[in-house]
Amino acid sequence: IFLSAFFTYVPMNEQIIIGRLGEDIILPSSFERGSEVVIHWKYQDSYNSYNVHSYYKGSGRLESQDTRYANRTSLFYNEIQNGNASLFFRRLSLLDEGIYTCYVGTAIQAITNKVVLKVGVFLTPMMKYEKRNTNSFLICNVLSVYPRPIITWKMDNTPISENNMQETGSLGPFSINSTLNITGSNSSYECTIENSLLKQTWTGRWTMKDGLHKMQSEHVSLSCELVNDYFSPNQDFKVTWSRMESGISSILAYYLSSSQNTTFYESRFSWNKELKNQSDFSMNLTDLSLSDSGEYLCNISSDEYTLLTIHTVHVEPSQETASDN
């Protein structure tokens, strides 16, 4: 009777914690300081309750810990006396998603804290431009994502439907390819992949420039600029210039913003301007020959964006060459 007069039970409160696959997380739980602290963390699914971590009589008690949590959980033992019952959780897997309940008892109080753990993953997606026979395709691809993302395609800023979507990984994480047939189009296209749990998005943008007609031995300038609504000066990105030929892409130049290093794989290729402001990556190709006709692709990519710019170059025989023939 004496005890019950001073013993209080605090009802359950709940919070949502979002973690990333493979990373560590803290499931928070606090209580009013007291003596004779007992802590039990449990995981509840539709059918059973599993012991995650226990503490009583001044030390961690793992005899009844479920094997899935072995070597993956710990408490902040030196902070328990200050009312910290939070659980440190290592190497999250998708199977760890669910409801965790922390029961804390002291000599004067019992509390229950509920934590809903959600786990997400979002590996950097990419946008690819492919030619198959006479058809052109844009592919937005994400290798590992959870939960299932929202994929948005836009043509000239208006949403459109994708042509084909392939998904693997029935329970997650998912690998997704979303394809759009853009044969014969000179519109601009955008693909956005959105993980609403992790509050992360990635956008790929594709732009086809007007065809360039040049004479043999002339030079051509191929434009490629960062658009002002995308990249910021402090963002790491890479720029790749390549040439598409018979469905195969060969790299002509490569630039890394972090090191500000450029590698040229074609001696006739050079930057139009000094890369001082790191926003204009236009290229010059000199001494054109007939075999330089084709599609040139500028790819600017960061963790958040891919910008693809396509140029079609037509090189025609010069007058002298034509008259020689």
Epitope: I150, P159, E162, E194, Q200, T203, N228, Q235, E304
Partner: antibody
Framework: QVQLQQSGAELAKPGASVKMSCKAS????????IHWIKQRPGQGLEWIGY????????EYNQKFKDKATFTADKSSSTAYMQLSSLTSEDSAVFYC????????????WGQGTTLTVSS | DIVLTQSPASLAVSLGLRATISCRSS??????????MHWYQQKPGQPPKLLIM???NLESGVPARFSGSGSGTDFTLNIHPVDEEDTATYYC?????????FGGGTKLEIK
């Protein structure tokens, strides 16, 4: 936790300008967009536009193009909206709201700044 | 601009029953994969709170009694079973093209 703290109520005269602020905390300011939304007393919501704090790129609803100007200060994680040539029609609650990059819905909102335009 | 019309303008629903709110757009705002319609709840003196994005995706932390559906021009927000704390005004919003617009709101009262 994510919070958008807006500046206090404003009382302004017709023809004047006001600048209200929206201070973000609990997330990386430059990784999201800040939208501004207007709500007149007893009426619905109107989207004014957004700013990308990372690059200072702005997009406006045509209706507000000559009325609103967005700026952002990355160092203080604060977005601003200036409203000019005020009339009684501008009396409203103005909200800032966070949006994911490339997604046009609003997952966190400020508490609102009440603007009263009166002579 | 795309006009969103919500109906009814107000409704009263008994505790524990279902509330259904409709939002009709003046043109289609969906593709074969996504509905570009989002739903918010606003209580008096508070800012709106996101409930559902892309027609049917529940925002993290929102109770499962809220659900959304629809495509094309017709979208629906369902609340079942309604709770006393659901007394609020509900707004739909599209993100199809600029400018993004909101519906006029539906005021829900719990009996």
């Amino acid at each position: 936790q994510v919070q958008l703290q807006q500046s206090g109520a404003e009382l302004a005269k017709p023809g004047a300008s006001v600048k209200m602020s929206c201070k973000a905390s609990g997330y990386t300011f430059t990784s999201f967009w800040i939208h501004w939304i207007k709500q007149r007393p007893g009426q619905g919501l109107e989207w004014i536009g957004y700013i990308i704090p990372n690059t200072d790129y702005t997009e406006y609803n045509q209706k507000f193009k000559d009325k609103a100007t967005f700026t952002a200060d990355k160092s203080s994680s604060t977005a601003y909206m200036q409203l000019s040539s005020l009339t009684s029609e501008d009396s409203a609650v103005f909200y800032c709201a966070r949006g994911l990059r490339g997604a046009y819905y609003f997952d966190y909102w400020g508490q609102g700044t009440t603007l009263t335009v009166s002579s | 601009d795309i006009v969103l019309t919500q109906s009814p303008a107000s409704l009263a629903v008994s505790l524990g029953l279902r509330a259904t709110i409709s939002c009709r757009s003046s043109q289609s705002v969906s593709t074969s994969t996504n509905g570009y319609m989002h739903w918010y709840q606003q209580k008096p003196g508070q800012p709106p709170k996101l409930l559902i994005m892309y027609a049917s995706n529940l925002e993290s932390g929102v109770p499962a009694r809220f659900s959304g559906s629809g495509s094309g021009t017709d979208f629906t927000l369902n609340i079942h079973p309604v709770d006393e704390e659901d007394t609020a005004t509900y707004y739909c919003q599209h993100s199809w093209v600029l400018p993004y617009t909101f519906g006029g709101g539906t005021k829900l009262e719990i009996k």
